[in-house]
Amino acid sequence: HRRLDKIEDERNLHEDFVFMKTIQRCNTGERSLSLLNCEEIKSQFEGFVKDIMLNKEETKKENSFEMQKGDQNPQIAAHVISEASSKTTSVLQWAEKGYYTMSNNLVTLENGKQLTVKRQGLYYIYAQVTFCSNREASSQAPFIASLCLKSPGRFERILLRAANTHSSAKPCGQQSIHLGGVFELQPGASVFVNVTDPSQVSHGTGFTSFGLLKL
């Protein structure tokens, strides 16, 4: 079967070659071809080109933010690991360590706190935050984790939020929050994770991580 397919492919390739050669001869005005033949071949070729171009335009309309396939649309993905920080800031710190992913320079970890993308498109963005808290030692307010976005020239905003009440376990009870969603990001957009009490975040291997993937 495979042999027959190969012969078929070769025959088609030969026909394409003859067709292209004929167009070339028409263009150079060779006398061996009648004018009628040339006109017919040319209009056939123009039809093919038109179909290809129309098809390309339709694809462009349907996927206005998508790049063409192949090298122009490389995989963009990042997965970073939590890093304990001496800073009292509510923005979590991350590092490229352990089993991390940073696909290429189209996504970067900036200042250890935010993932920044260079290409516009739809991204799945996620974060897992594990924290250890105790009801008595904590304030009445729940532990809240927020996934935030900063786009060039626009106000900072929250994309996703999740809250957990504090555990009654002593000295503290471990709980995990998972955030994830699909968002359109503009070039230069940065995403980061905010928590109400960074001192309660667990930084043990695999407990707290953050990442994104361009769809």
Epitope: G153, R154, F155, R157, I158, F183
Partner: antibody
Amino acid sequence: QVQLQESGPGLVKPSETLSLTCTVSGDSISSFIYYWGWIRQPPGKGLDWVGCIYSSGGTYYNPSLKSRVTISVDTSKNQFSLKLPSVTAADTAVYYCARLWLGTTTDYFDYWGQGTLVTVSS
Amino acid sequence: SYELTQPPSVSVSPGQTVSITCSGDKLGDKFACWYQQKPGQSPVVVIYQDDKRPSGIPERFSGSTSGNTATLTISGTQAMDEADYYCQAWDSNTVVFGGGTKLTVL
């Protein structure tokens, strides 16, 4: 139906502090899909953005006013406030509070209060 | 600081089409929106994201942006469209309004 209502003194003496409050009804000021802002309009003139605040307390101000403007939020009362100290006659304007809708690609003010005229005069 | 420039006034006869322009440096790279303000009333958004119309805004209002200019077009202008129109854009975390255009329906 979302409604915004400005309140505060209509007359403020020069060098004093202008204080206004906007009470929001029909929506939660804690919602993270909006910012809440102040825009002013001097009599017979155009619109002038003062600043905006988020439910988290994050603020953005007009650079020309940044040094003296403060916007704060009280989620328990569903209100946000504007404080502008050391006022002069140039601060006389109709002050509007508005909701800034946050879209995927752009943001705009979709609901406005009816405005309150604040006159700076001794 | 960033500036948006609008003509101070524009006039039109009822039923005619009128365009109000707003120009600013690299405005084509930003998104523009338009507000209508009738005398003694609060502004109302009529166009956002260059050409999107909020629900409740008549189809005769349309917007476009090209190069350094954003344009608000009102086709089949009615007497009720007489108002001040303000364009608005964003520049590095700052909300910028144009000076406004007074539209007079003759």
